[in-house]
């Protein structure tokens, strides 16, 4: 299975002695090593963190370990004005105030630079008005709204639940509906899981806990004012009103105490139904403004955060391929936390040192993988994803004619309950075969493979006997790789029963209580979890290193893309009459899958027959799996969208966490029935239609024999 | 172990100032939100003052408003509270106390209390 190029390690043994010098132990000590203070980024702290990793990886044996910096657009409060949220009388004053700080965690009163809640990119306001509470501030809540309670946002302040999407789309979404400030908040419907005590005496949030995070729509485009290039000592930057993805209105975010003063005197409309209310005793009525006794009460907004140009750094270790270093395989995780990092990002950054460590144990006894492996610790992940963004946009010629995969490294943990994992389908074999191999950390699993204790609890929606893998989606430092450069990416973690834990993430994310104790005390305290999942991400770096015949399978790609078809198909149905109408044909999409799947079928037969020690046709033969999933890349991109270029999957419209299939089509299709001129409605899914279809063939194609 | 210290307290003639202070020790002040209460002689207590665990909001009972004023330095670990214009009425034991929940937005129950400091308005 694996090359014996440049190796005093017989085959057998390689992946061996790789997973058996992966420890427990050290991931934890590396967790609280990186989790003592604040790293966000842009600052001092987090600089001298990416020198001391820059340091270790050197003294792990990496070949070379160079620091990579960009001057970006980041986003600061304003330490002498801070940012808060009143409830104010007739008379102008303010009778209510939001908290200025989270109430720090026991052991940690005295840190400095703790980075209040606040909601990155928020322009400067203080706008004041009525409250209108919207659920989640999905694109069917104010649907919900504005279409069939005839509430009018325009001129609100809007008050959102955390939760369900990515906030940066709530935020798009109030902007749209004409609201003039979001209030973003933690419901304990969503963040406190019943049963658990809060933190610090169990993992749920605290009423003064509060969720930071970026705001931004940027679809890809990484730093907000200078998209497509990097952000380099020569750059050209846009002025701020030509900046992408920059919200218009001012936001913060809350927790629940201070969500409990606000909706706790709201009038107006009832609730439209149950899945409207939340957890806190106050009546979630929608508004707009305060009930009866307080109607001439209003809400005030003060925000005074900066946008700054600052610089940010990325650590880059290279361990070089002894056979083929030209091609890359990257596994690539953020350093940069909003405070401690406890989970995100330090459980993943963790993992990531120890696989470095397992590495240059290995290389340091003679052994080398067949490909270059290149190792990232991504700056300023929080605000955009803009540290992997700005490398790549720098690197994007090597990238997308050397890049084999992608392996992201965030977050190892976002609960304890079974793996989860997203990747392309071309990793679906390679993530199957992997699990098989590796033992179970779950508690009735001792002895099964990870693959059994996985499938039992997250069994495949389709395929009985396997487990569920998802689409990719974005929200983290693969979106470059995957949407833009068309690399084949793949993430894996531990994750929480979605059966009984219907709160979204974890309940502690981006506030100042994801702490090393967090994990310590309540999530992981043997980091087996943590363990199982350096074997999983290093396991598949090493595999896809590694193996001779690069571990691909393009026929799970053609089961997929008729799923995906037929997906599309059904929803196009939901309007026969305009298909007929306008001559709607999937055919052409239809022939193209099917074309697919038999040259898929065909290529895996060559492959299996192939005379592997002739380098030419081996070179040739990875050279046509390494380049299908860029095969997937228009070079125009999606509308309205030009960095999500993959035909197959982009970040959903709705929800930037979420992966959407087919998305040209889907969001062609998305409301179509309330769009004004219908004719050139469906003639834009005609274009999409169109587009998918000739991607997949030309796909396709390029796994038919060369000549 | 944790206490909490109050003083400052005195004789003062109505219409004058005085300024209590409250040192917290064995528990990080900032992260609760505390108060002033106070018992008149013969009498039962009377909360006084609130202020939450980063000085965002201030609560008064009406007896007070405008008058006192509650205020901390969480660097110090103490509470303060200013009292101006002082009558006799103002008369009382001043205990500061540690409101039960962190991070509470509005008063709540008390469960740390201090020893008292005494308060004497006369002319």
């Known amino acids: 299975k694996s090359s014996n190029e440049a190796t005093n390690i017989t085959p057998k043994h390689n992946m061996k002695a790789f997973l058996d010098e992966l420890k427990a132990e050290n991931i934890k000590k590396f967790l609280y090593n990186f989790t003592q203070i604040p790293h966000l980024a842009g600052t001092e702290q987090n600089f001298q963190l990416a020198k001391q990793i820059q340091s270790q990886w050197k003294e792990f044996g990496l070949d070379s370990v160079e620091l990579a910096h960009y001057d970006v657009l980041l986003s600061y409060p304003n330490k002498t004005h801070p940012n808060y949220i009143s409830i104010i009388n007739e008379d102008g004053n303010e009778i209510f105030n939001t908290s200025l700080f989270e109430p720090p965690p026991p052991g940690y009163e005295n840190v400095s630079d703790i980075v209040p809640p606040f909601s990155a990119f928020s322009p400067q306001g203080m706008p004041e008005g009525d409250l209108v509470y919207v659920n989640y501030a999905r694109t069917e809540d104010f649907f919900k709204l504005e279409r069939d309670m005839k509430i009018n946002c325009s001129g609100k302040i809007v008050i959102a639940r955390y939760g369900k999407v990515f906030r940066g789309n709530k935020v798009k979404n109030a902007q749209l509906a004409g609201a003039k400030g979001v209030i973003l908040y933690s419901d304990p419907a969503d963040y406190f899981a019943p049963g658990v005590k809060s933190y610090p005496d169990g993992w749920n949030l605290p009423g003064g806990g509060v969720q930071r995070g970026n705001i931004l729509n940027l679809n890809g485009a990484g730093d907000p004012l200078t998209p497509g290039y990097p952000a380099n000592e020569y750059a050209y930057r846009r002025g701020i009103a030509e900046a992408v993805g920059l919200p218009s209105i001012p936001v913060h975010p809350i927790g629940y105490y201070d969500a409990q003063k606000l909706l706790e005197k709201m009038g107006g409309s009832a609730p439209p139904d149950s899945s409207w209310r939340g957890s806190l005793k106050v009546p979630y009525n929608v508004g707009p403004g305060f009930t009866g006794n307080f109607s001439t009460q209003k809400v005030k907004m003060h925000i005074h955060s900066t946008n700054e140009v600052t610089r940010i750094y990325n650590v880059i270790g290279t361990l070089r391929g002894a056979v083929e270093p030209d091609r890359y395989v990257i596994l690539g995780g953020h350093r940069d936390s909003w405070v401690f990092g406890g989970i995100d990002p330090q459980s993943g950054a963790a993992v990531v040192h120890e696989i470095v460590r397992s590495f240059g144990t290995l290389k340091k006894e003679g052994w080398r993988p067949r490909r270059t492996i290149l190792f990232a610790s991504w700056d300023a992940e929080e605000f955009g994803l803009l540290g992997s963004t700005e490398w790549a946009e720098e690197n994007s010629r090597l990238l997308q004619e050397r890049g084999v995969a992608y392996i992201n490294a965030d977050s190892s943990i976002e609960g304890n309950y079974t793996l989860r994992v997203d990747c392309t389908p071309l990793m679906y074999s390679l993530v199957h075969n992997l699990t098989k191999e590796l033992k179970s950390p779950d508690e009735g699993f001792e002895g099964k493979s990870l693959y059994e204790s996985w499938t039992k609890k997250s069994p495949s929606p389709e395929f009985s006997g396997m487990p569920r893998i998802s689409k990719l989606g974005s929200g983290n430092d693969f979106e470059v790789f995957f949407q833009r450069l068309g690399i084949a990416s793949g993430r894996a973690r531990y994750t929480k029963n979605w059966e009984t834990n219907k709160f979204s993430g974890y309940p502690l994310y981006h506030s100042v209580y994801e702490t090393y104790e967090l994990v310590e005390k309540f999530y992981d305290p043997m980091f087996k979890y943590h363990l199982t999942v350096a074997q999983v991400r290093g396991g598949m770096v090493f595999e896809l290193a590694n193996s001779i015949v690069l571990p691909f399978d393009c026929r799970d790609y053609a089961v997929v893309l008729r799923k995906y078809a037929d997906k599309i198909y059904s929803i196009s149905m939901k309007h026969p009459q305009e298909m007929k109408t306008y001559s709607v044909s999937f055919d052409s999409l239809f022939s193209a899958v099917k074309n697919f799947t038999e040259i898929a079928s065909k290529f895996s037969e060559r492959l299996q027959d192939f005379d592997k020690s002739n380098p030419i046709v081996l070179r040739m033969m990875n050279d046509q799996l390494m380049f299908l999933e860029r095969a997937f890349i228009d070079p125009l991109g999606l509308p309205d969208r030009p960095f999500y270029r993959h035909v197959i999957y982009a970040p959903s419209s709705h929800n930037k966490y979420a992966g959407e299939s087919f998305p040209g089509i889907y969001d062609a299709l998305f409301d179509i029935e309330s769009k004004v001129d219908p004719s050139k409605a469906w003639g834009e899914v005609k274009r999409q239609i169109y587009v998918a279809a000739f991607t997949v063939q030309a796909a396709a194609e390029t796994l038919s024999e060369v000549a | 172990e944790v206490q909490l210290v109050e003083s400052g307290g005195g004789v003062v003639q109505p219409g004058r100032s005085l300024r209590l202070s409250c040192a917290a020790s064995?528990?990080?002040?900032?992260?609760?939100?505390m108060n002033w209460v106070r018992q008149a002689p013969g009498k039962g207590l009377d909360w006084v003052a609130f202020?939450?665990?980063?000085?965002?909001?201030?609560y008064y009972a009406d007896s007070v408003k405008g008058r006192f004023t509650i205020s901390r330095d969480n660097s110090k670990n103490t509470l303060y509270l200013q009292m101006n214009s002082l009558k006799p009425e103002d008369t009382a034991v001043y205990y500061c106390?540690?409101?039960?929940?962190?991070?509470?937005?509005?008063?709540?129950?008390?469960?740390?209390w201090g020893q008292g400091t005494m308060v004497t308005v006369s002319s």
């Open positions: 202020i939450t665990y980063d000085g965002s909001n201030r």
């Open positions: 064995g528990f990080p002040l900032i992260s609760y939100g």
């Open positions: 106390a540690k409101d039960r929940i962190v991070g509470a937005r509005v008063p709540d129950a008390y469960d740390i």
